[in-house]
Interface confidence: medium
Protein backbone atom coordinates (compact mmCIF):
# COMPACT_ATOMS: atom_id res chain seq x y z
CA UNK A 1 0.00 0.00 0.00
CA UNK A 2 1.41 3.33 -1.09
CA UNK A 3 1.68 5.67 1.90
CA UNK A 4 2.63 8.85 0.03
CA UNK A 5 2.32 10.29 -3.46
CA UNK A 6 5.32 11.23 -5.60
CA UNK A 7 6.87 14.55 -4.72
CA UNK A 8 5.83 17.60 -6.75
CA UNK A 9 8.18 19.82 -8.71
CA UNK A 10 8.80 23.36 -7.51
CA UNK A 11 10.33 26.27 -9.38
CA UNK A 12 10.25 30.04 -9.57
CA UNK A 13 9.14 32.13 -12.55
CA UNK A 14 10.73 34.01 -14.14
CA UNK A 15 13.74 33.09 -11.99
CA UNK A 16 14.79 32.03 -8.52
CA UNK A 17 16.96 35.17 -8.32
CA UNK A 18 14.51 38.01 -7.80
CA UNK A 19 15.43 41.70 -7.73
CA UNK A 20 14.17 43.52 -4.66
CA UNK A 21 10.58 44.83 -5.02
CA UNK A 22 9.97 42.80 -8.18
CA UNK A 23 7.40 40.05 -8.67
CA UNK A 24 7.96 36.33 -8.65
CA UNK A 25 5.66 33.34 -8.91
CA UNK A 26 6.42 30.07 -7.15
CA UNK A 27 5.01 27.17 -9.10
CA UNK A 28 4.21 23.74 -7.75
CA UNK A 29 3.37 20.90 -10.13
CA UNK A 30 1.83 17.77 -8.68
CA UNK A 31 -0.82 15.45 -10.10
CA UNK A 32 -4.20 15.90 -11.68
CA UNK A 33 -6.83 15.31 -9.04
CA UNK A 34 -4.88 17.00 -6.26
CA UNK A 35 -7.41 18.79 -4.07
CA UNK A 36 -4.93 20.84 -2.07
CA UNK A 37 -1.43 22.24 -2.43
CA UNK A 38 0.55 23.65 0.46
CA UNK A 39 3.53 25.95 0.12
CA UNK A 40 5.97 25.86 3.02
CA UNK A 41 8.55 28.54 3.74
CA UNK A 42 11.47 27.92 6.06
CA UNK A 43 9.66 24.87 7.40
CA UNK A 44 6.35 26.61 8.11
CA UNK A 45 3.06 26.60 6.25
CA UNK A 46 3.03 29.68 4.06
CA UNK A 47 0.05 29.34 1.75
CA UNK A 48 -2.65 26.93 0.65
CA UNK A 49 -4.30 26.58 -2.75
CA UNK A 50 -7.22 24.34 -3.62
CA UNK A 51 -7.50 24.02 -7.41
CA UNK A 52 -10.91 23.94 -9.04
CA UNK A 53 -11.65 21.62 -10.72
CA UNK A 54 -8.86 19.42 -9.35
CA UNK A 55 -9.13 16.81 -12.08
CA UNK A 56 -8.19 19.41 -14.72
CA UNK A 57 -5.32 21.11 -12.90
CA UNK A 58 -1.92 19.71 -11.98
CA UNK A 59 -0.08 22.94 -11.19
CA UNK A 60 -0.67 25.87 -8.87
CA UNK A 61 1.02 29.24 -8.62
CA UNK A 62 1.81 31.32 -5.55
CA UNK A 63 2.32 34.93 -6.55
CA UNK A 64 4.64 37.21 -4.61
CA UNK A 65 4.08 40.78 -5.81
CA UNK A 66 6.92 42.45 -3.91
CA UNK A 67 10.12 40.53 -3.25
CA UNK A 68 12.16 41.46 -0.20
CA UNK A 69 14.68 39.94 2.16
CA UNK A 70 11.95 38.65 4.46
CA UNK A 71 10.59 36.46 1.69
CA UNK A 72 13.95 35.11 0.59
CA UNK A 73 14.72 31.61 1.79
CA UNK A 74 13.83 27.99 1.26
CA UNK A 75 10.45 26.95 -0.09
CA UNK A 76 8.92 23.54 -0.62
CA UNK A 77 5.47 22.31 -1.54
CA UNK A 78 3.28 19.26 -1.04
CA UNK A 79 -0.09 18.22 -2.44
CA UNK A 80 -2.96 15.99 -1.42
CA UNK A 81 -5.18 13.63 -3.39
CA UNK A 82 -8.06 12.58 -1.19
CA UNK A 83 -6.51 11.95 2.21
CA UNK A 84 -3.14 10.94 0.79
CA UNK A 85 -0.31 13.47 0.94
CA UNK A 86 2.70 13.62 -1.33
CA UNK A 87 6.33 13.60 -0.37
CA UNK A 88 7.62 17.18 -0.07
CA UNK A 89 9.19 18.68 -3.15
CA UNK A 90 12.86 19.45 -3.26
CA UNK A 91 13.80 22.78 -1.71
CA UNK A 92 13.60 25.92 -3.79
CA UNK A 93 16.05 28.59 -2.71
CA UNK A 94 14.51 31.96 -3.50
CA UNK A 95 17.15 34.69 -3.55
CA UNK A 96 16.56 38.43 -3.36
CA UNK A 97 19.07 40.46 -5.36
CA UNK A 98 19.79 44.16 -5.83
CA UNK A 99 20.41 44.59 -2.13
CA UNK A 100 22.60 47.50 -1.01
CA UNK A 101 25.61 47.75 -3.32
CA UNK A 102 27.19 46.76 -6.63
CA UNK A 103 30.43 44.78 -6.75
CA UNK A 104 33.17 45.20 -9.33
CA UNK A 105 34.21 42.19 -11.39
CA UNK A 106 37.61 42.03 -13.07
CA UNK A 107 39.55 39.27 -14.77
CA UNK A 108 43.29 38.54 -14.87
CA UNK A 109 45.24 38.48 -17.13
CA UNK A 110 42.39 39.97 -19.16
CA UNK A 111 39.11 39.23 -20.93
CA UNK A 112 40.82 37.84 -24.02
CA UNK A 113 43.02 34.82 -23.35
CA UNK A 114 44.45 31.83 -25.16
CA UNK A 115 43.23 28.35 -24.39
CA UNK A 116 45.38 26.83 -21.67
CA UNK A 117 46.10 30.13 -19.90
CA UNK A 118 45.28 30.42 -16.22
CA UNK A 119 42.46 32.86 -15.59
CA UNK A 120 41.31 34.36 -12.30
CA UNK A 121 38.23 36.48 -11.69
CA UNK A 122 38.19 39.03 -8.87
CA UNK A 123 34.97 40.24 -7.28
CA UNK A 124 35.25 43.28 -5.02
CA UNK A 125 32.68 44.91 -2.76
CA UNK A 126 33.63 47.42 -0.09
CA UNK A 127 30.69 46.80 2.21
CA UNK A 128 30.00 44.29 4.96
CA UNK A 129 30.03 40.96 3.21
CA UNK A 130 32.52 38.13 3.16
CA UNK A 131 30.89 35.79 0.63
CA UNK A 132 30.93 36.35 -3.10
CA UNK A 133 29.28 34.51 -5.96
CA UNK A 134 30.49 34.23 -9.54
CA UNK A 135 27.91 33.26 -12.14
CA UNK A 136 28.50 32.26 -15.71
CA UNK A 137 25.43 32.99 -17.79
CA UNK A 138 24.02 30.21 -19.86
CA UNK A 139 21.49 27.46 -20.11
CA UNK A 140 23.21 25.44 -17.43
CA UNK A 141 24.58 28.24 -15.31
CA UNK A 142 27.31 27.57 -12.82
CA UNK A 143 27.79 29.46 -9.58
CA UNK A 144 31.09 29.52 -7.76
CA UNK A 145 31.37 30.68 -4.18
CA UNK A 146 34.35 32.62 -2.86
CA UNK A 147 35.32 34.30 0.39
CA UNK A 148 37.26 37.40 1.35
CA UNK A 149 36.95 40.55 3.42
CA UNK A 150 36.33 42.92 0.52
CA UNK A 151 37.42 40.79 -2.42
CA UNK A 152 37.24 37.17 -3.49
CA UNK A 153 39.36 35.34 -6.03
CA UNK A 154 37.86 32.86 -8.45
CA UNK A 155 40.64 30.89 -10.14
CA UNK A 156 39.36 29.06 -13.19
CA UNK A 157 42.71 27.39 -13.81
CA UNK A 158 43.83 26.65 -17.38
CA UNK A 159 40.85 27.62 -19.49
CA UNK A 160 39.35 25.99 -22.57
CA UNK A 161 36.93 27.39 -25.08
CA UNK A 162 34.18 25.96 -22.89
CA UNK A 163 34.96 28.75 -20.42
CA UNK A 164 33.93 31.35 -22.99
CA UNK A 165 30.95 33.36 -21.91
CA UNK A 166 29.61 36.20 -19.84
CA UNK A 167 30.31 36.33 -16.11
CA UNK A 168 28.81 38.40 -13.32
CA UNK A 169 29.40 38.43 -9.60
CA UNK A 170 27.37 39.23 -6.51
CA UNK A 171 28.18 39.98 -2.92
CA UNK A 172 26.16 37.77 -0.61
CA UNK A 173 24.89 39.19 2.68
CA UNK A 174 23.48 35.81 3.56
CA UNK A 175 22.60 32.72 1.55
CA UNK A 176 19.43 34.31 0.22
CA UNK A 177 20.24 38.04 0.02
CA UNK A 178 22.59 39.12 -2.72
CA UNK A 179 23.87 42.48 -3.90
CA UNK A 180 23.20 44.10 -7.24
CA UNK A 181 24.99 42.17 -9.99
CA UNK A 182 28.32 43.46 -11.20
CA UNK A 183 28.71 44.72 -14.71
CA UNK A 184 29.16 41.69 -16.99
CA UNK A 185 32.59 40.59 -18.08
CA UNK A 186 32.81 38.67 -21.33
CA UNK A 187 35.59 36.09 -21.40
CA UNK A 188 36.94 35.28 -24.86
CA UNK A 189 39.05 32.15 -25.15
CA UNK A 190 40.84 31.56 -28.44
CA UNK A 191 43.37 29.03 -29.71
CA UNK A 192 43.56 25.27 -29.96
CA UNK A 193 46.23 24.13 -27.52
CA UNK A 194 44.10 21.14 -26.56
CA UNK A 195 41.42 19.32 -28.44
CA UNK A 196 38.56 21.60 -27.50
CA UNK A 197 36.07 19.47 -29.41
CA UNK A 198 36.25 17.08 -26.46
CA UNK A 199 35.63 19.84 -23.91
CA UNK A 200 32.28 19.57 -22.13
CA UNK A 201 29.59 22.13 -22.81
CA UNK A 202 30.21 23.47 -19.31
CA UNK A 203 33.57 22.77 -17.67
CA UNK A 204 33.76 20.65 -14.56
CA UNK A 205 34.76 22.40 -11.36
CA UNK A 206 35.72 21.13 -7.92
CA UNK A 207 32.68 19.62 -6.26
CA UNK A 208 33.25 21.54 -3.05
CA UNK A 209 32.88 24.94 -4.70
CA UNK A 210 30.42 24.47 -7.51
CA UNK A 211 26.74 23.79 -7.54
CA UNK A 212 24.77 23.47 -10.72
CA UNK A 213 21.87 25.85 -11.13
CA UNK A 214 19.38 24.95 -13.81
CA UNK A 215 18.18 28.36 -14.84
CA UNK A 216 15.42 29.28 -17.21
CA UNK A 217 17.19 31.78 -19.40
CA UNK A 218 15.69 34.10 -21.96
CA UNK A 219 17.36 32.11 -24.69
CA UNK A 220 16.44 28.68 -23.46
CA UNK A 221 13.00 28.66 -21.92
CA UNK A 222 11.76 25.15 -21.48
CA UNK A 223 8.04 24.71 -21.07
CA UNK A 224 8.19 21.40 -19.27
CA UNK A 225 9.16 22.76 -15.90
CA UNK A 226 9.37 19.28 -14.50
CA UNK A 227 12.75 19.23 -16.24
CA UNK A 228 13.66 22.56 -14.76
CA UNK A 229 13.57 21.64 -11.10
CA UNK A 230 15.34 24.69 -9.78
CA UNK A 231 16.03 22.95 -6.56
CA UNK A 232 19.33 21.49 -7.76
CA UNK A 233 20.83 24.45 -5.95
CA UNK A 234 23.47 22.70 -3.92
CA UNK A 235 25.31 25.96 -3.42
CA UNK A 236 22.81 27.30 -0.93
CA UNK A 237 22.61 24.20 1.24
Amino acid sequence: QQQTLPKPFIWAEPHFMVPKEKQVTICCQGNYGAVEYQLHFEGSLFAVDRPKPPERINKVQFYIPDMNSRMAGQYSCIYRVGELWSEPSNLLDLVVTEMYDTPTLSVHPGPEVISGEKVTFYCRLDTATSMFLLLKEGRSSHVQRGYGKVQAEFPLGPVTTAHRGTYRCFGSYNNHAWSFPSEPVKLLVTGDIENTSLAPEDPTFPADTWGTYLLTTETGLQKDHALWDHTAQNLLR
Epitope: E21, H40, F41, E42, G43, S44, L45, F46, A47, F62, Y63, I64, P65, D66, M67, N68, R70, M71
Partner: antibody, heavy 122, light 107 residues
Protein backbone atom coordinates in the same frame (compact mmCIF):
# COMPACT_ATOMS: atom_id res chain seq x y z
CA UNK B 1 9.98 55.07 6.57
CA UNK B 2 7.02 52.70 6.48
CA UNK B 3 4.01 53.98 8.36
CA UNK B 4 0.26 53.74 8.72
CA UNK B 5 -1.65 56.82 9.86
CA UNK B 6 -5.20 56.36 11.13
CA UNK B 7 -8.19 58.67 11.33
CA UNK B 8 -11.93 58.52 11.92
CA UNK B 9 -12.50 57.40 15.49
CA UNK B 10 -14.76 59.02 18.03
CA UNK B 11 -17.86 58.73 20.17
CA UNK B 12 -20.92 57.19 18.55
CA UNK B 13 -24.30 56.01 19.77
CA UNK B 14 -25.29 52.33 19.64
CA UNK B 15 -26.78 51.35 16.29
CA UNK B 16 -25.00 54.16 14.44
CA UNK B 17 -22.15 53.97 11.93
CA UNK B 18 -18.54 55.08 11.78
CA UNK B 19 -15.83 54.85 9.14
CA UNK B 20 -12.17 54.40 9.97
CA UNK B 21 -9.37 55.22 7.56
CA UNK B 22 -5.74 54.15 7.40
CA UNK B 23 -3.28 55.92 5.08
CA UNK B 24 -0.07 54.10 4.13
CA UNK B 25 3.30 55.47 3.11
CA UNK B 26 6.85 54.24 2.72
CA UNK B 27 6.05 50.86 1.16
CA UNK B 28 4.28 49.41 -1.86
CA UNK B 29 0.79 49.45 -0.38
CA UNK B 30 -0.77 47.51 -3.26
CA UNK B 31 1.47 44.49 -2.54
CA UNK B 32 0.43 43.86 1.05
CA UNK B 33 -2.57 42.55 2.90
CA UNK B 34 -3.78 44.95 5.60
CA UNK B 35 -5.83 44.07 8.66
CA UNK B 36 -7.75 45.67 11.49
CA UNK B 37 -7.04 44.61 15.07
CA UNK B 38 -8.81 46.05 18.10
CA UNK B 39 -8.16 46.27 21.81
CA UNK B 40 -10.94 46.90 24.31
CA UNK B 41 -9.92 49.02 27.33
CA UNK B 42 -7.68 46.97 29.63
CA UNK B 43 -8.03 43.88 27.42
CA UNK B 44 -5.96 41.95 24.89
CA UNK B 45 -5.70 42.12 21.12
CA UNK B 46 -8.52 40.85 18.89
CA UNK B 47 -8.34 40.47 15.12
CA UNK B 48 -11.31 42.17 13.44
CA UNK B 49 -10.90 42.01 9.68
CA UNK B 50 -8.39 41.65 6.88
CA UNK B 51 -8.13 42.28 3.17
CA UNK B 52 -5.62 40.79 0.77
CA UNK B 53 -3.18 42.75 -1.37
CA UNK B 54 -5.46 43.30 -4.36
CA UNK B 55 -8.79 43.51 -2.53
CA UNK B 56 -10.00 40.23 -3.96
CA UNK B 57 -10.36 38.50 -0.62
CA UNK B 58 -11.66 39.68 2.74
CA UNK B 59 -12.21 38.11 6.13
CA UNK B 60 -14.05 39.02 9.31
CA UNK B 61 -14.23 37.94 12.90
CA UNK B 62 -17.56 36.32 13.76
CA UNK B 63 -18.29 39.15 16.18
CA UNK B 64 -18.40 41.76 13.38
CA UNK B 65 -19.51 39.72 10.39
CA UNK B 66 -22.41 41.37 8.56
CA UNK B 67 -21.86 44.69 10.33
CA UNK B 68 -18.35 45.74 9.34
CA UNK B 69 -16.96 46.09 5.82
CA UNK B 70 -13.27 46.34 4.99
CA UNK B 71 -12.12 47.92 1.73
CA UNK B 72 -9.05 49.44 0.17
CA UNK B 73 -8.14 51.94 -2.51
CA UNK B 74 -4.71 51.05 -3.84
CA UNK B 75 -4.65 54.22 -5.93
CA UNK B 76 -4.91 56.28 -2.75
CA UNK B 77 -2.79 53.95 -0.58
CA UNK B 78 -5.71 53.79 1.82
CA UNK B 79 -7.60 51.21 3.85
CA UNK B 80 -11.09 51.63 5.28
CA UNK B 81 -13.32 49.98 7.85
CA UNK B 82 -17.00 50.80 7.59
CA UNK B 83 -18.65 49.96 10.92
CA UNK B 84 -22.42 49.77 11.00
CA UNK B 85 -24.89 48.81 13.74
CA UNK B 86 -22.29 49.56 16.38
CA UNK B 87 -22.63 48.01 19.83
CA UNK B 88 -21.19 48.86 23.22
CA UNK B 89 -18.91 45.84 22.98
CA UNK B 90 -17.27 47.36 19.88
CA UNK B 91 -15.71 50.01 22.11
CA UNK B 92 -11.95 49.67 21.63
CA UNK B 93 -8.81 51.14 20.19
CA UNK B 94 -8.70 50.06 16.54
CA UNK B 95 -5.37 49.49 14.84
CA UNK B 96 -4.65 48.94 11.17
CA UNK B 97 -1.71 46.61 10.62
CA UNK B 98 0.31 45.54 7.60
CA UNK B 99 1.16 41.94 6.87
CA UNK B 100 4.86 41.24 7.15
CA UNK B 101 4.86 39.41 3.81
CA UNK B 102 3.71 40.63 0.43
CA UNK B 103 0.99 38.60 -1.25
CA UNK B 104 -1.45 36.52 0.74
CA UNK B 105 0.93 34.92 3.18
CA UNK B 106 1.56 34.82 6.92
CA UNK B 107 -0.59 37.28 8.80
CA UNK B 108 2.15 38.42 11.15
CA UNK B 109 1.93 42.20 11.40
CA UNK B 110 5.10 44.26 11.18
CA UNK B 111 3.77 47.81 10.83
CA UNK B 112 0.91 49.16 12.94
CA UNK B 113 -1.05 52.39 12.87
CA UNK B 114 -1.08 54.58 15.94
CA UNK B 115 -4.58 53.41 16.87
CA UNK B 116 -7.85 55.25 16.99
CA UNK B 117 -10.40 55.10 19.83
CA UNK B 118 -13.96 54.14 19.05
CA UNK B 119 -16.41 54.61 21.90
CA UNK B 120 -19.94 53.30 21.50
CA UNK B 121 -22.16 54.77 24.18
CA UNK B 122 -25.50 56.46 24.56
CA UNK C 1 -10.73 29.01 15.74
CA UNK C 2 -7.32 28.23 17.19
CA UNK C 3 -7.04 29.23 20.83
CA UNK C 4 -3.76 30.65 22.12
CA UNK C 5 -2.96 30.39 25.82
CA UNK C 6 -0.10 32.34 27.35
CA UNK C 7 1.54 31.78 30.69
CA UNK C 8 2.14 33.35 33.06
CA UNK C 9 -0.40 36.15 32.75
CA UNK C 10 2.01 38.40 34.64
CA UNK C 11 5.47 38.19 36.15
CA UNK C 12 7.80 40.37 38.18
CA UNK C 13 11.47 40.47 37.29
CA UNK C 14 14.57 42.58 37.77
CA UNK C 15 16.89 44.18 35.23
CA UNK C 16 19.36 41.54 34.06
CA UNK C 17 17.02 38.61 34.70
CA UNK C 18 16.36 35.92 32.13
CA UNK C 19 12.64 35.90 31.38
CA UNK C 20 10.66 33.13 29.66
CA UNK C 21 7.08 33.39 28.44
CA UNK C 22 5.25 30.41 26.99
CA UNK C 23 2.41 30.17 24.52
CA UNK C 24 0.36 27.09 23.73
CA UNK C 25 -1.87 26.59 20.69
CA UNK C 26 -5.05 24.50 20.85
CA UNK C 27 -3.89 22.66 17.71
CA UNK C 28 -0.67 22.36 15.74
CA UNK C 29 0.34 25.54 13.97
CA UNK C 30 3.72 24.43 12.60
CA UNK C 31 5.95 27.42 13.36
CA UNK C 32 3.49 30.10 12.26
CA UNK C 33 3.75 32.13 15.44
CA UNK C 34 4.58 35.77 16.13
CA UNK C 35 5.47 37.61 19.32
CA UNK C 36 4.66 41.27 20.00
CA UNK C 37 5.61 43.78 22.65
CA UNK C 38 3.14 46.46 23.68
CA UNK C 39 3.67 49.41 25.99
CA UNK C 40 0.80 51.41 27.52
CA UNK C 41 -0.87 53.72 25.03
CA UNK C 42 1.21 52.42 22.13
CA UNK C 43 0.64 50.06 19.23
CA UNK C 44 2.09 46.54 19.42
CA UNK C 45 5.57 46.01 18.01
CA UNK C 46 6.58 42.85 16.16
CA UNK C 47 9.52 41.07 17.82
CA UNK C 48 9.55 37.53 16.40
CA UNK C 49 7.80 35.92 13.45
CA UNK C 50 7.77 32.35 12.15
CA UNK C 51 8.40 31.28 15.78
CA UNK C 52 12.10 32.10 15.81
CA UNK C 53 12.93 34.75 13.23
CA UNK C 54 13.97 38.04 14.80
CA UNK C 55 12.34 41.09 13.28
CA UNK C 56 14.77 43.63 11.85
CA UNK C 57 15.90 46.14 14.47
CA UNK C 58 14.88 44.01 17.45
CA UNK C 59 17.68 43.45 20.00
CA UNK C 60 19.25 39.99 19.97
CA UNK C 61 18.39 39.44 23.65
CA UNK C 62 14.94 38.47 22.36
CA UNK C 63 14.62 34.97 20.96
CA UNK C 64 11.80 32.62 20.08
CA UNK C 65 11.57 28.87 19.84
CA UNK C 66 9.07 26.09 19.46
CA UNK C 67 6.98 24.35 16.84
CA UNK C 68 3.63 22.62 16.71
CA UNK C 69 1.73 23.64 19.82
CA UNK C 70 4.32 24.87 22.34
CA UNK C 71 6.30 28.07 21.96
CA UNK C 72 8.62 30.20 24.06
CA UNK C 73 9.73 33.81 24.05
CA UNK C 74 12.96 34.39 25.96
CA UNK C 75 14.53 37.68 27.01
CA UNK C 76 18.08 36.72 27.91
CA UNK C 77 18.86 39.77 30.03
CA UNK C 78 15.92 42.02 30.86
CA UNK C 79 16.48 45.72 30.20
CA UNK C 80 14.50 48.67 31.64
CA UNK C 81 12.80 49.27 28.28
CA UNK C 82 11.56 45.66 28.17
CA UNK C 83 8.91 46.13 30.87
CA UNK C 84 5.73 45.80 28.82
CA UNK C 85 2.99 43.36 27.85
CA UNK C 86 3.87 40.56 25.43
CA UNK C 87 1.42 38.80 23.12
CA UNK C 88 1.77 35.69 20.99
CA UNK C 89 -0.26 35.34 17.81
CA UNK C 90 -0.76 32.43 15.47
CA UNK C 91 -0.60 33.20 11.78
CA UNK C 92 -1.29 29.66 10.64
CA UNK C 93 -4.96 30.04 9.81
CA UNK C 94 -7.74 32.60 9.60
CA UNK C 95 -8.76 34.13 11.88
CA UNK C 96 -5.37 35.00 13.31
CA UNK C 97 -5.69 34.75 17.09
CA UNK C 98 -3.74 36.24 19.98
CA UNK C 99 -2.83 35.02 23.41
CA UNK C 100 -4.28 36.95 26.34
CA UNK C 101 -0.95 38.64 27.05
CA UNK C 102 1.81 38.47 29.65
CA UNK C 103 2.61 41.60 31.64
CA UNK C 104 6.27 41.89 32.64
CA UNK C 105 6.60 44.19 35.64
CA UNK C 106 9.51 45.52 37.68
CA UNK C 107 10.17 43.55 40.84
Amino acid sequence: QMQLVQSGGGLVQPGRSLRLSCAASGFTFSSYGIHWVRQAPGKGLEWVSGINWNGGSTGYADSVKGRFTISRDNGKNSLYLQMNSLRAEDTAVYYCAKRAYSGDYYAAFDIWGQGTMVTVSS
Amino acid sequence: DIQMTQSPSSLSASVGDRVTITCRASQGISNALAWYQQKPGKAPKLLIYAASRLESGVPSRFSGSGSGTDFTLTISSLQPEDFATYYCQQHYSTPPTFGQGTKVEIK
